[in-house]
């Protein structure tokens, strides 16, 4: 696993413990909370990052209308169960034996139940809509410049293959980034759109997961882009199953 050899740190995940105890004295990094070995040449899975976060001490419009099945992460933080590959287990339960099913980004997609609740498979989130509102600037951003900058960001910083950034929409002051990645499209070694979206969200919140970096401050052709608010919508390959009571 690639880690900075000189001082043995993980460039892509500051929530790790690293030591030169890998094969041949190579630097090896393990995620806090789970103790799982992580690959520091790419993004760490959201499940392992959430687990690490919970273990750490407290410190005609061009815009897309989210589908009726789009999920927003309203439940917030929880200590997830991750599988051996670092993915979310389809069923998550808390200490009081309340259980629910989640999608591949760890967002609840069913009503809460008890230990008898079954979650047959981990349903993939194949479409993520990141909705940003920016603060007033010297003028509207040029759409193509903004598009290029955000695509560059996801390619270079988050190592997400450009084909998974489906579109960048802009209607001042709202920016929308659409990420799409079907199960069939995701090859071995490809960064998951859910992981890229989570790193981006943490960057915008000034809680960068990258080693030695603060938050992410974007600029487009020199113009500072100050984000006012962020909303992320998740669309699953199979629509979520909530009772009518929740929908009303």
């Amino acid at each position: 696993h690639t880690a900075a050899q000189d001082n043995c740190t993980c460039p892509t995940n500051k929530m790790t413990v690293c030591s030169p105890d890998g094969p041949g004295g190579r630097c090896q990094c393990r995620a806090l909370g789970s103790g799982m070995a992580v690959d520091c040449s790419t993004l760490t899975s959201k499940c392992l990052l959430l687990k690490a976060r919970m273990s750490a001490p407290k410190n005609a419009r061009t815009l897309v209308r989210p589908s009726e099945h789009a999920l927003v992460d309203n439940d917030g933080l929880y200590d997830p169960d991750c599988d051996p590959e670092g993915r979310f287990k389809a069923r998550q339960c808390n200490q009081t034996s309340v259980c629910w099913c989640v999608n591949s980004v760890g967002v609840r997609r069913t009503d809460k139940g008890d230990l008898s609740l079954r979650c047959d498979e981990l349903v993939r989130t194949h479409h993520i809509l990141i909705d940003l509102r920016h603060r007033p600037t010297a003028g509207a951003f040029n759409h193509s410049d903004l598009d290029a900058e955000l695509r560059r960001l996801f390619r270079e910083r988050y190592r997400l293959h450009p084909k998974f950034v489906a579109a960048v929409h802009y209607e001042q002051p709202t920016i929308q980034i659409e990420l799409r990645q079907n199960t069939s499209q995701k090859a071995a070694g490809d960064v998951d759109i859910g992981d890229a979206a989570y790193y981006f969200e943490r960057d915008i919140k000034g809680e960068s997961l990258f080693q030695g970096r603060g938050g992410l401050d974007l600029r487009v052709r020199g113009e500072p882009l100050q984000v006012e608010r962020t909303l992320i919508y998740y669309l699953d390959e199979i629509p979520p199953k909530f009772s009518m009571k929740r929908l009303t």
Epitope: A138, G139, I204, G206, G214, G215, D217, E223, Q226
Partner: antibody, heavy 119, light 106 residues
Framework: QVQLVQSGAEVKKPGASVKMSCKAS????????IHWVRQAPGQRLEWIGY????????KYNEKFKGRATLTSDKSASTAYMELSSLRSEDTAVYYC????????????WGQGTLVTVSS | DIQMTQSPSSLSASVGDRVTITCKAS??????LAWYQQKPGKAPKLLIS???SLETGVPSRFSGSGSGKDYTLTISSLQPEDFATYYC????????FGQGTKVEIK
């Protein structure tokens, strides 16, 4: 290395205008905005506004809207600030500054231009 | 506008002392906080950005911490060249500075 060199001190009468310059070198001028910040004697630093040399777009602190005018000359890699209707409270050191390469903090500063407003 | 309140406004300390300066924002600034050092007659010098990231060439005795609305600059062992005025600045919503903390020799 990055350098911002500002014009010399000015003494002005109340009601007059002052125009000062900030010459940038050591980087591509159009890559970053130029901020203007002032500091009155014994006071905190106060952000006036910025200009984007790319397109001459400007953003101002509400307090200075209508009185401060920011311009730039790409060919000379120079930014300018003009402040009109001067009053004694405008006596201050005026700084230009360039943002940090990765954040919106201000990493490189000019040496400052002292403006004294006195009758 | 976001207001930045620094405390104390001044402090007296000796070489070798540990010095702590705090900065409180009127709302959450999501770690978009910088600390500057300013000496008389000079322009401010950026020490820390992103609340915790030390700028290149800044001695490791300087450190930044905090989140949300509350941030701290710590000088672990004050050196003679550290006597100056320190300012915090938020850059989450435009740019505003704290009123400064003057660190004087006791």
């Amino acid at each position: 290395q990055v350098q911002l060199v500002q014009s010399g001190a000015e003494v002005k009468k109340p009601g007059a205008s002052v125009k000062m310059s900030c010459k940038a070198s050591g980087y591509t001028f159009t890559t970053y905005v130029i901020h203007w910040v002032r500091q009155a004697p014994g006071q905190r630093l106060e952000w006036i506004g910025y200009i984007n040399p790319n397109n001459d777009g400007t953003k101002y602190n509400e307090k200075f809207k209508g009185r401060a005018t920011l311009t730039s000359d790409k060919s000379a890699s120079t930014a300018y600030m003009e402040l009109s209707s001067l009053r004694s409270e405008d006596t201050a050191v005026y700084y230009c500054a360039r943002p940090h390469f990765e954040t919106h903090a201000m990493d490189y500063w000019g040496q400052g231009t002292l403006v004294t407003v006195s009758s | 506008d976001i207001q930045m309140t620094q405390s104390p406004s001044s402090l007296s300390a000796s070489v070798g002392d540990r010095v702590t300066i705090t900065c409180k924002a009127s709302e959450d600034i999501f770690n978009r906080l910088a600390w500057y050092q300013q000496k008389p007659g000079k322009a401010p010098k950026l020490l820390i950005s992103g609340a915790t990231s030390l700028e290149t060439g800044v001695p490791s005795r300087f450190s930044g911490s905090g989140s949300g609305k509350d941030y701290t600059l710590t000088i672990s062992s004050l050196q003679p060249e550290d006597f100056a005025t320190y300012y915090c600045q938020q850059y989450w919503n435009t740019w505003t500075f704290g009123q400064g903390t003057k660190v004087e020799i006791k």
